[in-house]
Interface confidence: medium
């Protein structure tokens, strides 16, 4: 029996269901009281999910996994892995045994896409040109890391005196949170774009200070 | 001196494959974004695919979407471009081209001399 | 037909000003800086201005660059034989998530 799953990385978003494909091809006269199929973690050979002794085993993880009864016979041992988390990401193997054996790794990758940023400005009041700002770009619940990158309002980016922190709150997404310092001209756009590598997403923010009343 | 040397062009059937090399030196390969640009005989320059600096990030030109594929080998300071299903319109000179921004694509400051690729029956 | 447009064809007399223009849109030039590159005949793209108006070194100081709102322009002073070639504006886009080329200036100089 040859085994066969997607090459590519399966994508999923946080709290979404994912499906990690995996085939073989049956025998004529193959019945499912002859499958053993299994889905194990790569990595730590923890049970997932198994289908033996002509019956569906059910999940031995989380209580979130699920095959498809009705297409197995037909040779899909496809693994339904639902409402998807942080933690789920990784290496799936899927093994199939009916006279011989064979088994492929499929890799989940999870995503969450990042909040469009808020932009806070230190001072806030009383601008000169001249003076020294801090602007903070802050943007939320996204996986994995974000990139961060600052550009002016002519589009030149920014790259003295930015601080980029990220912290992952209980569910494993990351808040980031960006701190640009720069010295104001007479007028300035300042931009910060929060990119998911994975999603490659891009969140946009900007702040502009004219010495008059600030837009965000 | 930074030197980016392109090599794998030729001629190929329409429907064919090519896999274009890029061998870089003179400077830390793995710290910058790279691209291949093409140049159509007597068109424009068209932005094909990059690739950041891990491999992890790639774009591609709608053109060539699910048909290329971009990736780098940072051990071997080679930067590749897997060409599959080719048509007639792919025939071009394929530049590599480094960036001068680490981690996105934003403006290529070295370029190599090309390496043509022809697709005809 | 290129995201950013750009005039065909451009001609001037040796020691005359001449200005390429780019216009783009709010996803590109708008949001990113502009860089411009120099093709000489039969060899590669060349580097020849980057963020909007800097020049890398050994590029001469005829060469300028500016930028405003989504459009952008490269002005060549003291036009010399030497300077013809084909020039390109780039930029990334932010919609498109890549990189887009103007579609090229043929500049030709004259006598």
């Known amino acids: 029996v040859e085994v066969q799953v997607s090459e590519d990385p399966v994508v999923a978003l946080v709290d979404t269901d994912a499906t990690l494909r995996c085939s073989f091809s049956p025998e004529p006269g193959f019945s499912l009281a002859q499958l053993n199929l299994i889905w194990q973690l790569t990595d730590t050979k923890q049970l997932v999910h198994s289908f033996t002794e002509g019956r569906d085993q059910g999940s031995a993880y989380s209580n979130r996994t699920a095959l498809f009864p009705d297409l197995l016979v037909q040779g899909n041992a496809s693994l339904r892995l639902q409402r998807v988390r942080v933690t789920d990401e990784g290496s799936y193997t899927c093994f199939v045994s009916i006279q011989d054996f064979d088994s492929a790794a499929v890799s989940l990758q999870v995503a969450a896409p990042y909040s469009k940023p808020s932009m806070t400005l230190e001072p806030n009041k009383d601008l000169r040109p001249g003076n020294m700002v801090t602007i903070t770009c802050s943007s939320y619940q996204g996986y994995p890391e974000a990139e961060v990158f600052w550009k002016d309002g002519q589009g030149v980016p920014l790259t003295g005196n930015v601080t980029t922190s990220q912290m992952a709150n209980e569910r494993g997404l990351f808040d980031v949170h960006s701190v640009l310092r720069v010295v104001l001209g007479a007028n300035g756009t300042y931009s910060c774009l929060v990119r998911n590598p994975v999603l490659q997403q891009d969140a946009h923010g900007s702040v502009t200070i004219t010495g008059q009343p600030l837009t965000f | 001196e930074v030197q980016l040397l392109e090599s794998g062009g030729g001629l190929v059937q329409p429907g064919g494959s090519l896999r274009l090399s890029c061998a870089a030196s003179?400077?830390?390969?793995?710290?910058?974004?790279m691209s291949w640009v093409r140049q159509a005989p007597g068109k424009g320059l068209e932005w094909v695919s990059g690739?950041?600096?891990?491999?992890?990030?790639?774009y591609y030109a709608d053109s060539v979407k699910g048909r290329f594929t971009i990736s780098r080998d940072n051990s071997k300071n080679t930067l590749y471009l897997q060409m599959n299903s080719l048509r007639a319109e792919d025939t071009a000179v394929y530049y590599c081209?480094?960036?001068?921004?680490?981690?996105?694509?934003?403006?290529?400051?070295?370029w190599g001399q090309g390496t043509l690729v022809t697709v005809s029956s | 037909q290129s995201v950013l447009t750009q005039p065909p064809s451009a001609s001037g007399t040796p020691g005359q000003r001449v200005t390429i223009s780019c216009s783009g849109s709010?996803?590109?030039?708008?949001?990113?800086?502009v860089t411009w590159y120099q093709q000489l005949p039969g060899t590669a793209p060349k580097l020849l201005i980057y963020?909007?108006?800097k020049r890398p070194s050994g590029v001469p100081d005829r060469f300028s660059g500016s930028k405003s709102g989504t459009s952008a322009s490269l002005a060549i002073s003291g036009l010399r034989s030497e300077d013809e070639a084909d020039y390109y504006c780039?930029?990334?886009?932010?919609?498109?998530?890549?990189?887009?080329f103007g579609g090229g200036t043929k500049l030709t100089v004259l006598g």
């Open positions: 963020y909007n108006n």
């Open positions: 780039g930029t990334w886009d932010d919609s498109l998530s890549g990189y887009v």
């Open positions: 690739i950041s600096p891990g491999g992890s990030n790639t």
């Open positions: 081209a480094k960036d001068a921004w680490i981690a996105r694509l934003l403006l290529f400051d070295y």
């Open positions: 709010s996803s590109n030039i708008g949001s990113n800086a």
């Open positions: 003179g400077f830390t390969f793995s710290d910058y974004a």
